[in-house]
Structures are given as structure tokens and as C-alpha cells.
């Protein structure tokens, strides 16, 4: 066979569906590898071709469009399963040819089997709730294109296993539910399980979130420098281990950079002659405010080193603040010698 | 709570405590008015755990406030601008969902006149 | 702003008879739909809750349906305590959280 490019497996789309669900797949050449859509191609005379490689096998095969009640069809750019079935995980491949040209794509594909309270190796996009903020919405995800906008369908809304009726402060609206206050307890995974009729057949698509409660944009501050501050002072003799924790206090932020760092004379540590190491631990609050520990540590500190200016900085996107460590030498203890003097007096 | 004649522009605290049960904190307190001889109109919520959300009638305009303590189970509506049109029984309402009220107050009766 | 049309007004049947009382939203609410009891003198009392789930300790012969934008409430085997006047209560939360009670619709038994 003639050349064709090749784009490879796309483990990056891994796709993942439920089995017995009806299931769109649309071909990633033209959303991520082409220039031009499918409506482009095809009036170019370019044929889009699919086949496909299962589980633990090499061999490539054609995709059986001739099963009964058409469960396999390809409509345009997208494959159909109309539903999917658990041995329908393997690699597709969809190829772009004509006599002259050719491009292809593979992906991996996933059926996956659910509890009956939707417990399954699915992974889960992730829905951050502002805390305490008022109305916010989730809506059902990746259901577009399964059903015409002439047909009505209904829509359940679970949390965990149960189903969503009468909550205090979660209302379920068709596609969306509507939080009307998030708290804490609103953490967890939300399904939301879309019921429609077509050709004389009902078809359920099973779509799960997780639902996480972060902090509010409200109670946002700039970073707070916990340690260094005034009341501790880092007295040390040369020779002495030198630690100096700068421990930052960061709110939530969607999308924003915390940053930690130290300077010694107003350079960073990597710029500079000393023996430093700076050891970084980050923990995080039920809301996701951060705190971060950045730790100085030089191992045999000189009295050099104890002049030193140590200031810690910490920047986000609510600002950016900076607070200097009091170093200083301890200052050696006075030495007292008694000298006795010892007369013996001749009689 | 304390109802009574008020005058036309005055102002009014109202407020209601669940007593003989203790109110969770997961409950909407609100609060539904009736004029004399008409039907039912929802003022507005508020969430026991939370005082920062409260949601309101669209008329409501800014003129009445939505309070609540928790360690009392109290919650309270301020009227203020007061007009005769405001002339009605106020109760407040409880309930778990958004208004799904299980428990309602006896009313208190409030008549704004010169 | 929601608003709740109630139809019609006043209704009336004998004893052991059958009512049924619609109520139509101006925007679609879905299920979340509530209906309550008031009796003269007294505070509203909560029937149903998501248009069609029975509250507690309310009889059988109470039921509602519907979804989107229209809903009925169905008092099958009337009796002369049901005699009072009921609302429905629409909950929708398009820009802010919104509730809005229907007119209110006068039940008498015969």
C-alpha cells in the first residue's frame, strides 16, 4: 500500500465510555492533526475509512457495520455504537484518503463496566464550587449530538447512589444542577443519567463528575508570611546549622501561580557562593487554601553567613509580599577565670 | 414575633425561634407574607449554616433584610420603608429543601397605617 | 421574575368525589414544584414536594404530576376536612433562586 501519514496511537485521548450506552466518537484527525474539517474533505473527494484492533490483538480489522439494528454506524466524522458492548475496547483507526492522499489516526477505546451506584475505573473530570458563594451550576457533560433538540429528555440527578430529590441546597434543573449554596458537604461524585427514545428504543447516557468545594474568591487575601516574623530570632554560633522555615499561607485562586521564595542579599540561592539547601513542603486545607514551607538550610553557617540579609517573598495572584529573618551571631558567653593566689607565710 | 401597627416609611423587626426542637443548620429559614383575604407571597431564604446566602423576591427591592442566629435558632426579618401595601400576616417557614417549608410559624400580624 | 398560574378557582365536589387542581409556570421548573394546604386561620400546611412526592403523614389520596411547566394536584375520595384553599409553590433558580406561589385555589366540598 501506498504511503500515509501516520499520526500514530493518541493516547492522549484516551476515551472512555459505559458499556450498554449508546457511545459518539468523533474522529480526531480533524480536531487536532488536519487543518480542514470533515465537510472540506469529503467535498474533495477524500473518504474517511474506519477499522479497528482489539483487546490483545495485532491484527487490524474492518468495523462490522452490518449488525443487527445498525448498533455500529458512522454518520460524516463520528462513529456510532448504538449501544456499546464491553468487547468493543480496542484501538480504532480512522484514515483520510483518495488516490493521492492519505492520513491516519488511532486511538485507544475503553468500555467500561458501572456499579449500580456508578462505582467504575472511569476517570472523572473534576468541578471546583466556590464556598458559600451562591448559585453555581454543574451541567451534565458530553451529551450533545446524541439527540435532536426535538427530543425532550429526562434527566436524573444522583449523588453517590442517591438520587437527588428534595436536597436543601441542590436543585436539580434538566441538564444543570443548581447549588444554591456550596458547602464541604457537598463534596463528592455527581451522575447525572440522561434517558432518551429513539427508533422505538430507550438509550441512557451515564455522565459522572466530582464535585469539589474550594475556597470562595470572596475571603481571598494575599499571601500571609507565617514564619519568619519579628518574634523569632535566629541566633546561631559559626560553625552551627542554620534552618530557617518561611511557612506561607495562600487562598484558594482558580488558576493562579503560589510562589515561594528566598533571597540572601537580595540574590536567589542559586546565584551565590553559599553552601544553601531550600527543602519545599505544600499541605492543603479541606478548601484547598495552600501552605507552603520552604526551608533555608546551611549546614555549617560562617559569621559571614550571619550578616547575612535571608528574606522570604511569596507572590499570587492576589499579590505579593516579602518578610526578612532576624539572623544574628550569638554572642559567646564571658569567661571567667579566678586566679587564687596562694601565699605561705614563713613564721 | 412581635407584629403591630407600624406607620407608613417606619420600620420593623421581625423575628422567630424554633423552641421545643433544635433547628439544623442545613435548614433555609424564610419568610411568606399574606395580605388580608389574598394568597401566599414568598419574601425570601436564607441558609441557617451561612448568613452570606440569602435570596430574596424580586419586589423585595432592597427594602427588607433576611438575618439569622444559629445558637438561638433565630431568624429574623427586618422590614423597612413600610407602606400600607406591606399590611399582612408574616410567617416564617422552615424546611430542609428550598422551599419544601414542613414547618411554619402561626404568623404574625403586621398593619402599616397613619 | 417566575410566575405560577393556578386554575380554576374556587372548585368544588361532594364527598368521596374527585378534584383536580392545575397549575402552570411561566418558565420550565422541571419537578421542582411543592404543593401546600391552608386552612382559614391557620399556616399553610406542605402536601407534596418534587411535584409528585408525598410529604410525610399526608394521606394517599393526595397526589401530583407533572414536570416542566404544567402540574396537577389530584384529591381523589374527598373528604369534608379537605375543604381549604391550596397554593402551588414553583422553585427556579435561572438568575437568582426564585420561589413563586400560584393565586391559590379555593377547594369547597359539597
Known amino acids: 500500500s501506498e504511503r500515509c501519514d501516520d499520526w500514530g496511537l493518541d493516547t492522549m485521548r484516551q476515551i472512555q465510555v459505559f458499556e450498554d450506552e449508546p457511545a459518539r466518537i468523533k474522529c480526531p484527525l480533524f480536531e487536532h492533526f488536519l487543518k480542514f474539517n470533515y465537510s472540506t474533505a469529503h467535498s474533495a473527494g477524500l473518504t474517511l475509512i474506519w477499522y479497528w484492533t482489539r483487546q490483545d490483538r495485532d491484527l487490524e480489522e474492518p468495523i462490522n457495520f452490518r449488525l443487527p439494528e445498525n448498533r455500529i454506524s458512522k454518520e460524516k466524522d463520528v462513529l456510532w455504537f448504538r449501544p456499546t458492548l464491553l468487547n468493543d475496547t480496542g484501538n480504532y483507526t480512522c484514515m483520510l484518503r483518495n488516490t493521492t492522499y492519505c492520513s491516519k489516526v488511532a486511538f485507544p477505546l475503553e468500555v467500561v463496566q458501572k456499579d449500580s451506584c456508578f462505582n467504575s475505573p472511569m476517570k472523572l473530570p473534576v468541578h471546583k464550587l466556590y464556598i458559600e458563594y451562591g448559585i453555581q451550576r454543574i451541567t451534565c457533560p458530553n451529551v450533545d449530538g446524541y439527540f435532536p433538540s426535538s427530543v425532550k429528555p429526562t434527566i436524573t440527578w444522583y449523588m453517590g447512589c442517591y438520587k437527588i430529590q428534595n436536597f436543601n441546597n441542590v436543585i436539580p434543573e434538566g441538564m444543570n444542577l443548581s447549588f444554591l449554596i456550596a458547602l464541604i458537604s457537598n463534596n463528592g461524585n455527581y451522575t447525572c443519567v440522561v434517558t432518551y427514545p429513539e427508533n422505538g428504543r430507550t438509550f441512557h447516557l451515564t455522565r459522572t463528575l466530582t464535585v469539589k468545594v474550594v475556597g470562595s474568591p470572596k475571603n481571598a487575601v494575599p499571601p500571609v508570611i507565617h514564619s519568619p516574623n519579628d518574634h523569632v530570632v535566629y541566633e546561631k554560633e559559626p560553625g552551627e546549622e542554620l534552618l530557617i522555615p518561611c511557612t506561607v499561607y495562600f487562598s484558594f485562586l482558580m488558576d493562579s501561580r503560589n510562589e515561594v521564595w528566598w533571597t540572601i542579599d537580595g540574590k536567589k540561592p542559586d546565584d551565590i557562593t553559599i553552601d544553601v539547601t531550600i527543602n519545599e513542603s505544600i499541605s492543603h486545607s479541606r478548601t484547598e487554601d495552600e501552605t507552603r514551607t520552604q526551608i533555608l538550610s546551611i549546614k555549617k553557617v560562617t559569621s559571614e553567613d550571619l550578616k547575612r540579609s535571608y528574606v522570604c517573598h511569596a507572590r499570587s495572584a492576589k499579590g505579593e509580599v516579602a518578610k526578612a529573618a532576624k539572623v544574628k551571631q550569638k554572642v559567646p558567653a564571658p569567661r571567667y577565670t579566678v586566679e587564687l593566689a596562694c601565699g605561705f607565710g614563713a613564721t | 414575633a412581635e407584629g403591630g401597627l407600624v406607620k407608613p416609611g417606619g420600620s420593623l423587626e421581625l423575628c422567630c425561634k424554633a423552641s421545643g426542637f433544635s433547628l439544623s443548620t442545613s435548614y433555609w429559614r424564610c419568610w411568606v407574607r399574606q395580605a388580608p383575604g389574598k394568597g401566599l407571597e414568598w419574601i425570601g431564604c436564607i441558609y441557617a449554616g451561612s448568613g452570606d446566602v440569602t435570596y430574596y423576591a424580586n419586589w423585595v427591592n432592597g427594602r427588607f433584610t433576611l438575618s439569622r442566629d444559629i445558637d438561638q435558632s433565630t431568624g429574623c426579618l427586618q422590614l423597612n420603608s413600610l407602606t400600607a401595601a406591606d399590611t399582612a400576616m408574616y410567617y416564617c417557614?422552615?424546611?430542609?429543601?428550598?422551599?419544601?417549608?414542613?414547618?411554619w410559624g402561626q404568623g404574625t400580624l403586621v398593619t402599616v397605617s397613619s | 421574575a417566575l410566575v405560577m398560574t393556578q386554575t380554576p378557582s374556587p372548585v368544588s365536589a361532594a364527598v368521596g368525589g374527585t378534584v383536580t387542581i392545575n397549575c402552570q409556570a411561566s418558565?420550565?421548573?422541571?419537578?421542582?414544584l411543592a404543593w401546600f394546604q391552608q386552612k382559614p386561620g391557620q399556616p399553610p400546611k406542605l402536601l407534596i414536594y418534587d411535584a409528585s412526592t408525598l410529604a410525610s403523614g399526608v394521606p394517599s389520596r393526595f397526589s401530583g404530576s407533572g414536570s416542566g411547566t404544567e402540574f396537577t394536584l389530584t384529591i381523589s375520595g374527598l373528604q369534608s376536612d379537605d375543604a381549604a384553599t391550596y397554593y402551588c409553590?414553583?422553585?427556579?433558580?435561572?438568575?437568582?433562586?426564585?420561589?413563586?406561589f400560584g393565586g391559590g385555589t379555593e377547594v369547597v366540598v359539597k
Open positions: 417557614a422552615s424546611g430542609v429543601g428550598f422551599g419544601y417549608f414542613n414547618l
Open positions: 409553590l414553583g422553585v427556579y433558580t435561572h438568575i437568582s433562586a426564585d420561589n413563586a
Open positions: 418558565e420550565d421548573i422541571y419537578s421542582n
